[in-house]
Interface confidence: low
């Protein structure tokens, strides 16, 4: 059920493209294709290519993305395209000008002098933004989200975008300066991962990150469980980045117990993050436990 045909507007297309990209990434990283047959991988790659080609129709002259060509470009959507395309670079041929043009636009057009990334044109499909939805710590959460995308595109775009390292530093400065004031576990987790990627989650910040976990195994706010799966996935990625392998097993156990296999309304971010985090875990953690995740690879009929 993770392999779907992407279609629709610039937002719906990314909703459709997400599960296929992350499923292929997960199975590649964990070397599990033999369970499904390599021919299925080829079919999945064709769908990713289709999604990529379709997404280019929603690329604006500024290199940013929006739901429709005639809609103001969205910071979040553009950052998400960067994130997904950065992961897909290893799977299909992606034009680096498309990817790095979007990175450049985020930095030059959407980053304020204090490092914050601003959203002037929120996505129509609010269900696709996961725990960022109705987040009262919006500046921190969105800046962390964009920063994570920029860091994932860093190796690809550093030569084309001179301002990328400075932009990353500035956004990191903002997150670091405001981290201790965060109230929501979701924001603590996403900003924690962004800082961990930079080697800046330490001292009191690291203490806050770790003590925010409920029962030392999940980053949880009241409300939607999907957001807690997403937040805990960000936190797991941060822990793996920190090489804190003592803290990792109960978090992985909790995520595994949720039996969350992606798909369904509003699941875009939770799906992407849980599979990204668990793939990273199986790659990084010494003596990791084998995870029996139910990844079903039914290719859509043509």
């Amino acid at each position: 059920h993770l392999i779907v045909t992407p279609s629709g507007c610039g937002e719906q297309n990314m909703i459709g493209m997400t599960p296929t990209v992350i499923a292929v990434h997960y199975l590649d990283e964990t070397e599990q294709w033999e369970k499904f047959g390599l021919e299925k991988r080829q079919g999945a790659l064709e769908l990713i290519k289709k999604g990529y080609t379709q997404q280019l129709a929603f690329r604006q002259p500024s290199s940013a993305f929006a739901a429709f060509v005639k809609r103001a470009p969205s910071t979040w959507l553009t950052a998400y395209v960067v994130k997904v395309f950065s992961l897909a670079v290893n799977l299909i041929a992606i034009d680096s000008q498309v990817l790095c043009g979007a990175v450049k636009w985020l930095i030059l057009e959407k980053q304020k002098p204090d490092g914050v990334f601003q959203e002037d044109a929120p996505v129509i499909h609010q269900e696709m933004i996961g725990g960022l939805r109705n987040n009262n710590e919006k500046d921190m959460a969105l800046t962390a989200f964009v920063l994570i995308s920029l860091q994932e595109a860093k190796d690809i775009c550093e030569e084309q975008v001179n301002s990328l390292p400075g932009s990353i530093t500035k956004a990191g400065d903002f997150l670091e300066a405001n981290y201790m004031n965060l109230q929501r576990s979701y924001t603590v987790a996403i900003a924690g991962y962004a800082l961990a990627q930079m080697g800046r989650l330490k001292g009191p910040l690291l203490n806050k990150f770790l003590t925010t976990a409920k029962d030392k195994n999940r980053w949880e706010d009241p409300g939607k469980q999907l957001y807690n799966v997403e937040a805990t996935s960000y936190a797991l990625l941060a822990l793996l980045q920190l090489k804190d392998f003592d803290f990792v097993p109960p978090v992985v156990r909790w995520l595994n117990e949720q039996r969350y296999y992606g798909g369904g309304y509003g699941s875009t971010q939770a799906t992407f993050m849980v599979f990204q985090a668990l793939a990273q875990y199986q790659k990084d953690a010494p003596d990791h436990q084998e995870l029996n995740l139910d990844v079903s690879l039914q290719l859509p009929s043509r």
Epitope: F68, K70, A72, K110, K112, Q118, D120, A121, I124
Partner: antibody, heavy 119, light 108 residues
Amino acid sequence: SLEESGGRLVTPGTPLTLTCTVSGFSLSRYTMAWVRQAPGKGLEYIGWIDSSGSTYYASWAKGRFTISKTSSTTVDLKMTSLTTEDTATYFCASGNDGGDPLYYGMDPWGPGTLVTVSS
Amino acid sequence: DGVMTQTPSSTSAAVGGTVTIKCQASQSIRSWLSWYQQKPGQPPKLLIYEASKLASGVPSRFKGSRSGTEYTLAISGVQREDAATYYCLGSIASDDTAFGAGTNVEIK
């Protein structure tokens, strides 16, 4: 083309609904904004509605003004707790080429409808 | 609401001359600025969007430009029919959007 209707003389506190009717295109693919202009004064932005029905308002208009799509060719502006300060010509305008009117501009415009609030 | 400060409030120019109108944003609005022309008894007409893009059917003598948070509308080779009031519309965010106070342009 666009045309506003519903403007009339009302007493303070009375609610009023204005309608913008479009012809030649469908609101399922277009955005619509409302702007007003007090007699002899400048333009004042009220808010807009996108093709999916999401609404965006100027901070001063939140709570008292409601924009809604009532059919594929009509958009309403509901106004409550009217005061004499709300006396103005009310214009509806489409987002240029169906886009976000704050980014791509507003074009075309209706001729406007006059609302007079007086006791 | 103080988002946009438009200057001057009125100006005049001879036919063939140049008119320059400025709008200063209270903070960064990037390209979220459009310019409108309004003649008495008529609705406004879009001239420029995205700070510098010419709207369809608008003569090329109208030019929009941006420098930081200052936006300029220049009309070169002014014609009699350009006599009107000109407004900028700037948007920091959907709820923080405003027109400038307007500039009345008279042609001598």
